[in-house]
Amino acid sequence: SEAEDASLLSFMQGYMKHATKTAKDALSSVQESQVAQQARGWVTDGFSSLKDYWSTVKDKFSEFWDLDPEVRPTSAVAA
C-alpha cells in the first residue's frame, strides 16, 4: 500500500540519518588526523551518493510481499 511504502521510505531515511550522525559524531571525537578526516569525508560522500541514487528512482519499489518468495514452489513447467 502507499502507506506502507511511505512508512518504509521514512524508516530508511531516518535510519540513514541516524547512522550518518552516529558515524560523524564518532569521527569528530577522534583526533583530527589525516585518516580521520578522510574517513569523515567518506561517510559524507557515501551518504550523498545514496541520496543521489534514491533521487533517480522514478517509480515506487515493489513491496516486500510481492517480490520473489524465499522458498520456491515446485516448478510446473520445464523449458
Partner: antibody, heavy 114, light 112 residues
Framework: ELQLVESGGGLVQPGGSLRLSCAAS????????MRWVRQAPGKGLEWLSS????????SYADSVKGRFTMSRDNAKNTLYLQMNSLKSEDTAMYYC???????WGQGTQVTVSS | ATMLTQSPGSLTIVPGESASISCRAS???????????FYWLLQKPGQRPQLLIY???NRESGVPDRFTGSGSGTDFTLKISGVKAEDAGVYYC?????????FGQGTKLEIK
C-alpha cells in the same frame, strides 16, 4: 503436480462484468502472493495486479485500477479477478501466476465486443 | 513506468549456433532490498509463458544450462548456447523491482 487453472472467461459486451477464477493445487497456496497478467491478441504481456498471501493487500496497474478487483480464498485455494466496466481493449488471454512468475496457468480468454 | 527495451525484435538461428538477446531498462533495477528482480521468460507457440531465469542469472528448476542470464543495473543479456528446435518462441524480459511491474516487448526466436 503444481497446477494453476483459470476459468470464467468468455464473450461480454462493453460495460459488462466477468469474474475470473484460478484454482491452485500442488503447493501451499496460502504462503504465496499471486498475480494476474494478460496478453492481448498478438501482443506482449501486461501485469495487472498482485495480492498478498493473506489477501490483506492488493496493487493494480493504472489501466485496471478502479475497475478490476483481485481477491483470494485460501480455504478454497482459489484466486479471483472481478472485472467491471469492461472495454474492448480488455480483450485478452488472462493468466494467473504466483510471485516471481514461477508458475503460470493455461489462461482463460476474455473477449469484450458488442 | 519502467520501460524495458529488447533487441533484436526477432532473430533466426541455425540449430547448434548461439543466440543472444539484450534487454535495457529505463532505470536501475536494484531494489532497496539489495537484489535485482529481473527475469527472462519464454512463450512457445500456443503455450503459456514459462520462467527461465530469475534475479538476473538464476536458472529456474528444470531449465537447461544452455540458457544463461547475465547483466546488472540497467543492461541484461540472455544467451542460448547450442540452440535447439524446441527453443523457438517469444522471449520476454521482465522486472519486478518497481510497480507497475513491466515486460519487454518480446524477441521472436525462429529456428532455420
Amino acid at each position: 503436480e503444481l497446477q494453476l487453472v483459470e476459468s470464467g472467461g468468455g464473450l461480454v459486451q462493453p460495460g459488462g462484468s466477468l469474474r475470473l477464477s484460478c484454482a491452485a493445487s500442488g503447493f501451499t497456496f496460502s504462503s504465496y502472493s499471486m498475480r494476474w497478467v494478460r496478453q492481448a491478441p498478438g501482443k506482449g504481456l501486461e501485469w495487472l495486479s498482485s495480492i498478498k498471501s493473506d489477501g490483506s493487500i492488493t496493487s493494480y496497474a493504472d489501466s485496471v485500477k478502479g475497475r478490476f478487483t483481485m481477491s483470494r480464498d485460501n480455504a478454497k485455494n482459489t484466486l479471483y479477478l472481478q472485472m467491471n466496466s469492461l472495454k474492448s481493449e480488455d480483450t485478452a488471454m488472462y493468466y494467473c501466476t504466483n510471485q516471481g512468475y514461477i508458475n503460470w496457468g493455461q489462461g482463460t480468454q476474455v473477449t469484450v465486443s458488442s | 513506468a519502467t520501460m524495458l527495451t529488447q533487441s533484436p525484435g526477432s532473430l533466426t538461428i541455425v540449430p547448434g549456433e548461439s543466440a543472444s538477446i539484450s534487454c535495457r531498462a529505463s532505470q536501475s533495477l536494484i531494489h532497496s532490498a539489495g537484489k535485482t528482480y529481473f527475469y527472462w521468460l519464454l512463450q512457445k507457440p500456443g503455450q503459456r509463458p514459462q520462467l527461465l531465469i530469475y534475479q538476473v542469472s538464476n536458472r529456474e528448476s528444470g531449465v537447461p544450462d544452455r540458457f544463461t542470464g547475465s547483466g546488472s543495473g540497467t543492461d541484461f543479456t540472455l544467451k542460448i548456447s547450442g540452440v535447439k528446435a524446441e527453443d523457438a518462441g517469444v522471449y520476454y524480459c521482465a522486472q519486478g523491482t518497481y510497480n507497475p511491474k513491466t515486460f519487454g516487448q518480446g524477441t521472436k526466436l525462429e529456428i532455420k
